[in-house]
């Protein structure tokens, strides 16, 4: 019991301190005294809840103490001088000093004051995020991964996408123990739409200033989806010549573009060069109907195309095409 | 060497009071809160109260409150602990000790009768 | 007040035995308990402060544990130099108070 009138003692320390696994952090406690108060310290202690016994103890004559020497120190307080920093050192942190820890001052004449500190035990995880290359297969799969690798807590992962799709999200043990791994998958329905189109993957950790982000190229893998152009219905006979474009999307790129008709090889006023056909120019009318089959990895495609080359006003002489 | 060397035993009667010397030398007297501690013959040991020497600020056990005075003379480097008010059960051997949390240093002891 | 109930009051041992004096607070006094040595006809002796840190000086021999309310003192192998009765003390709170003491004897 203090004597009456007596302005109290007050021990100052943050209610929680973060340190990373590995690393050393600074448990801070002091002893704040009022302007007229007097105040005699003789010892330090520093204890961890339910754990029988002190950590560590400085005494006004004996100096420090510690029950794991190698691991524990005192910062600030020395013998010969005023006890009044109890701020205590940890080295090689480990998962297993996470807790609550009791820093308490020995005092004339007030007695005994004290204030708990909560050590949380951080580790900053590593993130990456990879595309999950797919196929064509009318149901949902992953197209993206995200990994936080060996964080503690866990790291929050999410998404953002505007192609719709959902997160698939599993924890598993890190690789030192207490940490954790959390891996994120983006689910959704392959189409060529989505090919080269991206999503983010945004990891959250009390170890960040601010939230990872890590973009995905999607890669989807599909045939060909083709089309031809270049025909506008208003070729005419003794026009200049023309070009008809077989246009193809996929993934991978076409190996091949094989031009036909259906009455079987192409005639000899057509000329195949690759994703193109040449139409010469001709001096009667013709109603063909084109064919356009374009080959990858994953098949084949075509698409079909009439042209007619009518006899028309020769007043225009821009040729077949408005190419 | 830390000593703590007090004053000699005392006979006194029921209603007297007694003051007991503790002389310390071998360390730096204001650094440290002198305590005083009682022993009954063959009995546990009582604490009594204690008085830091800088600015004579004092805690006492509440069972002695207004019969006992802790003081200090820091030109001699000296505490004195006065209890008033005697009565029997008062025998005992009357220490000062040295405080550090604990008792790190004590004195030889000095024994107070009371008796009529 | 904080109680502090010492057992045994009183205990017989041999040199070289193993022994162990336990102290019981009436509550938490955390890791604040001291425990001493009294010899016949002289002061208390500090051996072990905060539950559990040898005083320099102190043969190694003599251990402290616990916290909370549960203490311990622990003599690992009994000396004749030994015989004397053991006090704790919590400086936790005011006011300071002691257990009533052991008594060792050497048999």
């Known amino acids: 019991w203090p004597p009456p009138g007596t302005g109290d003692i007050i021990v100052q320390a943050p209610t929680q301190v973060p340190g990373f696994l590995g690393d050393s952090v600074t448990l801070p406690c002091y002893l704040q005294v009022p302007g007229m108060e007097e105040t005699h310290v003789s010892q330090l202690t520093w204890s961890r809840h339910g754990e029988s016994g002190s950590m560590a103890v400085f005494h006004q004559t004996q100096g420090p103490n510690y029950s794991e020497p190698k691991r524990l120190e005192f910062v600030a307080a020395r013998l010969g001088t005023e006890l009044r920093d109890a701020s205590l050192r940890m080295f090689g942190l480990r998962v297993e000093d996470e807790g609550n820890y009791t820093c308490l001052f020995v005092t004339f004449p007030q007695g005994s004051r004290s204030v708990d500190i909560w050590l949380r035990v951080l580790a900053k995880p590593q993130n990456t995020a990879e595309v999950q290359k797919v196929q064509l297969t009318g149901k949902p799969v992953p197209v993206a991964r995200c990994v936080s690798t060996g964080g503690r807590p866990p790291a929050h992962i999410t998404w953002h996408s505007d192609l719709g799709g959902m997160p698939n999200t599993s924890q598993a043990p890190g690789f030192l123990s207490g940490t954790v791994t959390v891996t994120s998958l983006w689910i959704l329905v392959p189409s060529s739409q989505v090919d080269g189109k991206s999503v983010t993957c945004k990891v959250e950790h009390e170890s960040f200033e601010k939230p990872q982000l890590l973009t995905v190229n999607l890669t989807v893998y599909y045939p060909p989806e083709v089309s031809i152009s270049g025909y506008d219905n208003n070729w005419y006979l003794s026009q200049n010549e023309a070009t008809l474009t077989c246009d193809a999307r996929s993934n991978p790129e076409p190996t091949g573009y094989n031009w036909s008709t259906t009455m079987g090889p192409l005639p000899p006023f057509a000329v195949a060069q690759g994703a193109q056909l040449l139409i010469r120019p001709v001096d009667k009318p013709i109603n063909t109907t084109f064919i356009c089959n374009v080959t990858n990895a994953l098949g084949a495609r075509q698409a079909e195309l009439t042209v007619q080359v009518k006899e028309g006003p020769p007043s225009e002489p821009s040729g077949m095409s408005s190419n | 060497e830390v000593q703590l060397v007090q004053s000699g035993s005392e006979l006194k009667k029921p209603g007297a009071s007694v003051k007991i010397s503790c002389k310390t030398s071998?360390?730096?007297?204001?650094?440290?809160?002198m305590h005083w501690v009682r022993q009954p013959h063959g009995k546990g040991l009582e604490w009594i109260g204690g008085i830091h020497p800088n600015q004579g600020e004092t805690s006492y056990n509440q069972r002695f409150k207004g019969r006992v005075t802790l003081t200090v003379d820091k030109s001699t480097s000296t505490a004195y602990m006065e209890l008033s008010s005697l009565r029997s059960e008062d025998t005992a051997v009357y220490y000062c000790?040295?405080?550090?949390?604990?008792?790190?240093?004590w004195g030889q002891g000095t024994l107070v009768t009371v008796s009529s | 007040d904080i109680q502090m109930t010492q057992s045994p009051s009183a205990m017989s041992a041999s040199v070289g035995d193993r022994v162990t004096i336990t102290c019981k607070a009436s509550q938490n006094v955390g890791t604040n308990v001291a425990w001493y040595q009294q010899k016949p006809g002289q002061p208390p002796k500090a051996l072990i402060y905060s539950a559990s840190y040898r005083y320099s000086g102190v043969p190694d021999r003599f251990s402290g544990s616990g916290s909370g309310t549960d203490f311990t003192l622990t003599i690992s192998s009994l000396q004749a130099e030994d015989l004397a009765e053991y006090f704790c003390?919590?400086?936790?709170?005011?006011?300071?108070?002691f257990g009533q003491g052991t008594k060792l004897e050497i048999k």
């Open positions: 071998g360390y730096t007297f204001t650094e440290y809160t």
């Open positions: 000790a040295r405080w550090t949390g604990d008792f790190d240093y």
């Open positions: 003390q919590q400086y936790e709170s005011y006011p300071y108070t």
